[in-house]
């Protein structure tokens, strides 16, 4: 059925009208407007931008636009006491200091309030000691160091290259290894694409460029001082010692010019293999400490940042639904940036702005969506997804009863090669159908659909003729909606052809060089990729809000559940003897998946045949679809991660950016061979299989005929 049947609207107000109203030139103008000065969370500049967006969304025609403020823990460098790292000689004299700021890009030399590179939420401290190079500081890197190379990081300052995993996981791993400080740096192997010039002549990272970012391990908690509850006027705040997820050791980021000076002196053990070598002309020795001539020299960190409770502002816009105003489809993306935010987040915010404008235009012509659409400009995403999480905590009772879907809208581009989509399996068919109707912006695919270019450039590893759609992880504002509340979620952006570098981001990520010019000159001069992303995000919102029957296909969940069950079973089968010894069986899980598959199939048949003119039955069927994602939520949450409650998906415990399937079982099995009490460890595996099997079975039953 076409979307126009949703409400009594003239046929011209369909998806096509909405999509045709989206203009690349407007996105370009909005991006320029949003990127001329920094919009750091908690600053006056970002408050002013919130008010500007509120005003413009009202002008565009939304029914209401409100600011929602919270007082959350943020982190800033000390303006008079800058952070840096030095090499000190045996007398304690500083013989080398890292730079205090990034050289500003051309045209921005006189901009004030550019926050220098820092690791947000680092504690203060001035540790000094020998350096140990820990590669990417992943779990497996520390296993290699400690178990294979017998290198002890206790009492050492570790230096790790950015990339592969979320920086907070790196810091957590370093803490667990006993390090007393962490230096993060961008190696050209990960942030300098061969054959491309560095900014301002190209999109590569210059040697003085540095990636900012928070180093929290919040596990979905939101504001560290008010986990589970909104940071409102009457909030009870924890003491800083009880705050959630704060690092305990000083951390600081540097660029590769400074890293060269630290790494070139490294002595000790040689790198274990070539995967530990980057692209600098240094030996990549692991250490500990410097080589012969420099063995008396040490590294000293000088970190003086402060944590401060600061007010943040979300902008929440409402376009009331004509038929089901109590069903919410949410489009949200953040507004705060580290500096100019040329890509992150403003390439996304500009797209949201244009989507709001298009919806507003239709509304002014008398149209309304079937369901309510909420638009959000989140604050303090860069400080731990704080704005979105606090708002969801404040509105959790409404959201869990009324939330249909959440579409995320951070950076629209991280490259210009092909589409990248991460979403719940419920949205697979929606994404496939939508992209078949959209034109590809890619060179060589003129006149072809987006689906075709996407499938060709990023094929599914399992299903031929279909594009890759990835699992949702975290590191963005969908987290609370999907992982905590169980609201069907998705995200889409244009990406690079860089499969091996999946979680490293684009070279200028979170640096001062992420400017409007970066996008306009090098990534998307015609803004055609931005327009395509606007069409995908906006088109998904349109369909979710306007189709009579929700565009969710529960059969796709059945397919992936079988795939995930097979995967976790094969991981467990690496320990056949223990499985036998401790009577570990996956039968209950496979049985639950089989039941889910059968029930989902029958539900889909009923969905084709029921009387859509009966509003009660329609609402009942739609509610079963809406609440299916919710059914995968375990109110008790995952072990030690109470705000990650989705049993099928969670952010990986080793990389917040990546999604893990059946995370409870996966974590119970991880490194199980090293556990001191195998009986207890395998008992936990059995418990997690039980929880997963029960949850899948319970979810299946929500799709059964109601009586």
């Amino acid at each position: 059925k076409s979307s126009n049947e949703a409400t009594n609207i003239t046929p011209k107000h369909n998806m096509k009208a909405f999509l045709d109203e989206l203009k690349a030139e407007n996105i370009k103008k909005f991006l320029y407007n949003f990127t001329q000065i920094p919009h750091l969370a908690g600053t006056e500049q970002n408050f002013q931008l919130a008010k500007q967006i509120q005003s413009q969304w009202k002008e565009f025609g939304l029914d209401s636009v409100e600011l929602a403020h919270y007082d959350v823990l943020l982190s800033y460098p000390n303006k008079t006491h800058p952070n840096y790292i030095s090499i000190i000689n045996e007398d304690g004299n500083e013989i080398f200091n890292t730079s205090l700021f990034e050289p500003p890009p051309p045209g921005y030399e006189n901009v004030s309030d550019i926050v220098p590179p820092f690791s947000a939420f680092s504690p203060q401290g001035m540790p000094e000691g020998d350096l140990v190079y820990v590669n990417y500081a992943r779990t497996e890197d520390f296993f290699k160091l400690e178990r294979d190379m017998k290198i002890n990081c206790s009492g050492k300052i570790v230096i790790a290259r950015y990339g592969k995993v979320f920086r907070g996981n790196k810091v957590k791993n370093a803490q667990l290894a006993g390090a007393k400080g962490v230096i993060l740096y961008s190696d050209p192997a990960d942030y300098f694409a061969p054959g491309v010039k560095s900014y301002p002549d190209g999109w590569n990272l210059p040697g003085g460029g540095v990636q900012r970012g928070n180093i929290l391990n919040l596990n979905g908690a939101g504001d560290p001082l008010t986990p589970g509850y909104p940071a409102n006027e009457y909030a009870y705040r924890r003491g800083i010692a009880e705050a959630v997820g704060l690092p305990s050791i000083p951390v600081h980021p540097i660029g590769y010019y400074d890293a060269q000076k630290l790494l070139e002196k490294m002595g000790g053990s040689a790198p274990p293999d070539s995967s530990w070598r980057g692209s600098l002309k240094v030996p990549y020795n692991v250490g500990p400490g410097f080589t012969g001539n420099f063995s008396t020299q040490k590294v000293k960190m000088h970190i003086h940042s402060t944590n401060e409770v600061t007010r943040i502002y979300n902008v929440i816009g409402t376009l009331r639904g004509a038929v089901e105003p109590d069903r919410y489809v949410i489009l949200g993306g953040h507004r705060d940036s580290w500096v100019f935010g040329g890509i992150d987040p403003q390439s996304g915010a500009a797209v949201v702005h244009e989507i709001v404008r298009s919806f507003g235009t239709l509304k002014k012509e008398g149209w309304r969506p079937r369901r309510t659409i909420l638009f959000a400009s989140w604050d303090a995403e860069e400080f731990g997804l704080l704005g979105s999480t606090e708002w969801a905590e404040e509105n959790s009772r409404l959201l869990q009863e009324r939330g249909v879907a959440y579409i995320n809208a951070d950076s629209s581009i991280e490259g210009n090669y092909t589409l990248r989509v991460d979403c719940t399996p419920l949205m697979y068919s929606l994404v496939h159908n939508l992209t078949k109707e959209l034109k590809s912006p890619d060179e060589g695919f003129e006149g072809k659909s987006l689906y075709e270019s996407w499938t060709k450039k990023s094929p599914s590893p399992e299903f031929s003729g279909m594009p890759r759609i990835s699992k949702l992880g975290s590191g963005n504002d969908f987290e609370v909606f999907f992982q905590r509340l169980g609201i069907a979620s998705g995200r889409a952006r244009y990406t690079k052809n860089w499969e091996t570098n999946k979680f490293s981001g684009y070279p200028l990520y979170h640096s001062v060089y992420e400017t409007y010019e970066l996008v306009e000159k090098f990534y998307d001069p015609m803004f055609k990729y931005h327009l395509t992303v606007a069409q995908v995000r906006g088109g998904m919102v349109f369909e979710l809000a306007n189709s009579i029957v929700l565009p969710f296909d529960c059969r796709d969940y059945a397919v992936v559940l079988r795939k995930y069950a097979d995967k976790i079973y094969s991981i467990s089968m690496k320990h056949p003897q223990e499985m036998k010894t401790y009577s570990v069986s996956f039968d209950s899980l496979f049985s639950a998946v089989k039941n889910f598959t059968e029930i989902a199939s029958k539900f889909s048949e009923r969905l084709q045949d029921f009387d859509k003119s009966n509003p009660i039955v329609l609402r009942m069927m739609n509610d079963q679809l809406m609440f299916l994602e919710r059914a995968f939520i375990d109110p008790l949450g995952l072990p030690d991660r109470p705000f990650y409650r989705h049993v099928i998906y969670a952010p990986s415990s080793h990389n917040k950016y990546a999604g893990e399937s059946f995370p409870g079982i996966y974590d119970a099995l991880f490194d199980i061979e090293s556990k001191v009490d195998p009986s207890k460890a395998w008992g936990e595996v059995k418990r997690q299989i039980y929880v997963a099997a029960f949850t899948v079975q319970a979810a299946a039953e929500t799709l059964s005929e109601v009586a």
Partner: antibody
Framework: QVQLVQSGAEVKKPGASVKLSCKAS????????INWVRQTPEQGLEWMGG????????NYNENFKGRVTMTRDTSSSTAYMELSRLRSDDTAVYYC?????????????WGQGTTVTVSS | DVVMTQSPLSLPVTLGEPASISCRSS???????????LHWYQQKPGQSPRLLIY???NRFSGVPDRFSGSGSGTDFTLKISRVEAEDVGVYFC?????????FGQGTKLEIK
């Protein structure tokens, strides 16, 4: 733009010392090593060594060890090279050259050269 | 020290014709990170040397695309696809993989 401006020509007697300067501009001085290279018709181009302006660390060619000293003054973005116990075969054009760091690790900018004549 | 040997030492070329210079090192120039730090410099009469090609095959900014570099391990080549009058000068290969850095003797390119 990047410039390396070297001091003027020198005439020295055997056994004396000469100290040459190289003033850098147009880039962040402390980020990039300064190399010293000399050129003679007989030996061609010879790398004498380099200095890291950030920490003052030096790396000398063994052929010149004990005779060459490289220093820098970060406040004036100037590198210096002193060669002692001069001999007649030290007569050459002496160049300072900026190391390009990643991705080059090559001498990306050169000074105009200083002619040193050693003659009794 | 790594010895860099260039050939020929003198190269007379007709304008518009190609030219090729060979450079051989006494040991491999592959660094532990997998990169090869072999570079080519051009020195025009009365001028300082200037970087032409870095890391075997990468043209430095502003260098015309008629210049190209190739090779691996110990054998390297600089090619000029069509020689122009302004290309007259001496061409040096150089390595910065091993300390001390060393240069070839130079190849003098002249117009026939």
């Amino acid at each position: 733009q990047v410039q390396l401006v070297q001091s003027g020509a020198e005439v020295k007697k055997p056994g004396a010392s000469v100290k040459l300067s190289c003033k850098a501009s147009g880039y962040t001085f402390t980020y990039f090593d300064i190399n010293w290279v000399r050129q003679t018709p007989e030996q061609g181009l010879e790398w004498m060594g380099g200095i890291s302006p950030g920490d003052g660390n030096t790396n000398y060619n063994e052929n010149f060890k004990g005779r060459v000293t490289m220093t820098r003054d970060t406040s004036s973005s100037t590198a210096y090279m002193e060669l002692s116990r001069l001999r007649s075969d030290d007569t050459a054009v002496y160049y300072c050259a900026r190391d390009g760091n990643f991705p080059y690790y090559a001498m990306v900018n050169w000074g105009q050269g200083t002619t040193v004549t050693v003659s009794s | 020290d790594v010895v860099m040997t260039q050939s020929p030492l003198s190269l007379p070329v007709t304008l518009g014709e190609p030219a090729s210079i060979s450079c051989r090192s006494s040991q491999s120039l592959v660094y532990s990170n997998g990169n090869t730090y072999l570079h080519w410099y051009q020195q025009k009469p009365g001028q300082s040397p200037r970087l032409l090609i870095y890391k075997v095959s990468n043209r430095f900014s502003g260098v015309p695309d008629r210049f190209s570099g190739s090779g691996s391990g110990t054998d390297f080549t600089l090619k000029i696809s069509r020689v122009e009058a302004e290309d007259v000068g001496v061409y040096f290969c150089s390595q910065s993989t091993h300390v001390p850095y060393t240069f070839g003797q130079g190849t003098k390119l002249e117009i026939k």
